[in-house]
Interface confidence: low
Amino acid sequence: EEELQVIQPDKSISVAAGESATLHCTVTSLIPVGPIQWFRGAGPGRELIYNQKEGHFPRVTTVSDLTKRNNMDFSIRISNITPADAGTYYCVKFRKGSPDHVEFKSGAGTELSVRAKPSAPVVSGPAARATPQHTVSFTCESHGFSPRDITLKWFKNGNELSDFQTNVDPAGDSVSYSIHSTAKVVLTREDVHSQVICEVAHVTLQGDPLRGTANLSETIRVPPTLEVTQQPVRAENQVNVTCQVRKFYPQRLQLTWLENGNVSRTETASTLTENKDGTYNWMSWLLVNVSAHRDDVKLTCQVEHDGQPAVSKSHDLKVSAHPKEQGSNTAPGPALASAAPL
């Protein structure tokens, strides 16, 4: 009779993580008598995966009934495959011996590769806020995918970015891989509503790439512009001076009025108006009693925004002129700013 052959028909199989893998093995003869065992790897360090006769292998089931007398199919199914299960599996026939069975013949091996989906990309921005015109870095990470082939793209508001560096680790063979990418983004004043998107494409995600996003509202600080204007006279001896705080983000803002360098009033921004681009405007006014001043008054609007050093703008109120004249020389509203920057 022809000598027994151990046939593993599949040179390699590729299975998605979480699926079951079927490893095929048939023998061509019932002789010699003896069990079949499955191993991962070869040589002295090989790992026993299944032993027909003894042991507990909870994830392994046999495809056919091994108790049948004429059974020659020793295929096994391994459930809930993870990337750690990757490797070459050998179906090995043993000859009955005393006290131990003797290895008789091995199949050629089946290489199991595991396809695992990448985790959802996590995008993180800088720890501190930055102002427009500055370049900030965003990182994107995704883990646990296999095979190693993967593509990563960066977008800002749907426009693809080109200034980024990507690494896939480890460089050599591994059961699964991670990707890490850093993109550089130049901030503009209009970026409060902007989004940075990291898009990962992998063969396990065909047609449906994974995306991670970061809102630039978490990253950007748009400093305010200040405008101090003198409004028309309300009463004979009173002048209304307004400080318009425009286009700032985030909302956190404190304003202090100074008269000739002395603190007159401090207030925290409330009832802000939001612009289309996501920035905010706020207005504060100061009613100045001109009759209480003998000399010209320097009014300063000082703004501390988001914990940054204060910025200020001043307005010189001339007391010598009659208030009514002064009012008539000043156009109403914020269109005319009789203000001098510090």
């Epitope: 599949d10 199989i13 494409a201 063969v203």
Partner: antibody
Framework: EVQLVESGGGLVQPGGSLRLSCAAS????????IHWVRQAPGKGLEWVAS????????YYADSVKGRFTISADTSKNTAYLQMNSLRAEDTAVYYC??????????????????????WGQGTLVTVSS | DIQMTQSPSSLSASVGDRVTITCRAS??????VAWYQQKPGKAPKLLIY???SLYSGVPSRFSGSRSGTDFTLTISSLQPEDFATYYC????????????FGQGTKVEIK
């Protein structure tokens, strides 16, 4: 709506070259295998080549290996088949098609259970002197 | 390479007939087998994918099945618009990169 439109076919002399285009709309070719399949007059379907542009994967039938080059331009959402050293037996209608798998997987054999779900109308290539 | 042997190469049938077309794979393959219908001068149309799943919009008289290495397309009750050529197709590589077609079966009016 998913659409594939081939162009670039025509009459060419043996040994000549042609470049076929397959313009896709309604989906992003970056994330799909695009295949070229040909059909000689009165004959059956013959697979020619496939490309998965995101990973730069390209595959060819033995009959065209070394003569044909498949590629894709994701910015134009278009796949191409550059055909060099053309022979009379390359005369055929050339179709491009999208390969899709609906998430089903055969763990037994390690294969996605996919198919060519959308095809173009085809473009005729005639190689004759 | 895996070969897909399709039979018969042609058949004559009448409206209302039950028609069966078979494709045999040259070796053990996955269920990544699809069936297509092609009419003269037109591109093929997908009917069945994954050996037995009916593609959307395809009439339920079409069905697919598998037995070992044999894959079968059945038309339960042939309609006038079903006279066409049918092809089986196997996606060989695990991501569907390589494709093999059967030789085709022409279904003609008896």
């Amino acid at each position: 709506e998913v659409q594939l439109v081939e162009s670039g076919g025509g009459l060419v002399q043996p040994g000549g070259s042609l470049r076929l285009s397959c313009a896709a709309s309604g989906f992003n070719i970056s994330y799909y295998f695009i295949h070229w399949v040909r059909q000689a007059p009165g004959k059956g379907l013959e697979w020619v080549a496939s490309v998965y542009s995101s990973f730069g994967y390209t595959y060819y039938a033995d009959s065209v290996k070394g003569r044909f080059t498949i590629s894709a331009d994701t910015s134009k959402n278009t796949a191409y088949l550059q055909m060099n050293s053309l022979r009379a037996e390359d005369t055929a209608v050339y179709y491009c098609a999208r390969f899709t798998f609906p998430g089903l997987f055969d763990g037994f054999f390690g294969a996605y259970l996919g198919s060519l779900d959308y095809w173009g109308q085809g473009t005729l290539v005639t190689v004759s002197s | 390479d895996i070969q897909m042997t399709q039979s018969p190469s042609s058949l004559s049938a009448s409206v209302g007939d039950r028609v069966t077309i078979t494709c045999r794979a040259s070796q053990s393959v996955s269920s990544a087998v699809a069936w297509y219908q092609q009419k003269p001068g037109k591109a093929p149309k997908l009917l069945i994918y994954s050996a037995s799943s009916l593609y959307s919009g395809v009439p339920s008289r079409f069905s697919g099945s598998r037995s070992g290495t044999d894959f079968t397309l059945t038309i339960s009750s042939l309609q006038p618009e079903d006279f066409a050529t049918y092809y089986c197709q196997q996606a060989v590589n695990w991501v569907g990169a390589l494709v093999t077609f059967g030789q085709g079966t022409k279904v003609e009016i008896k």
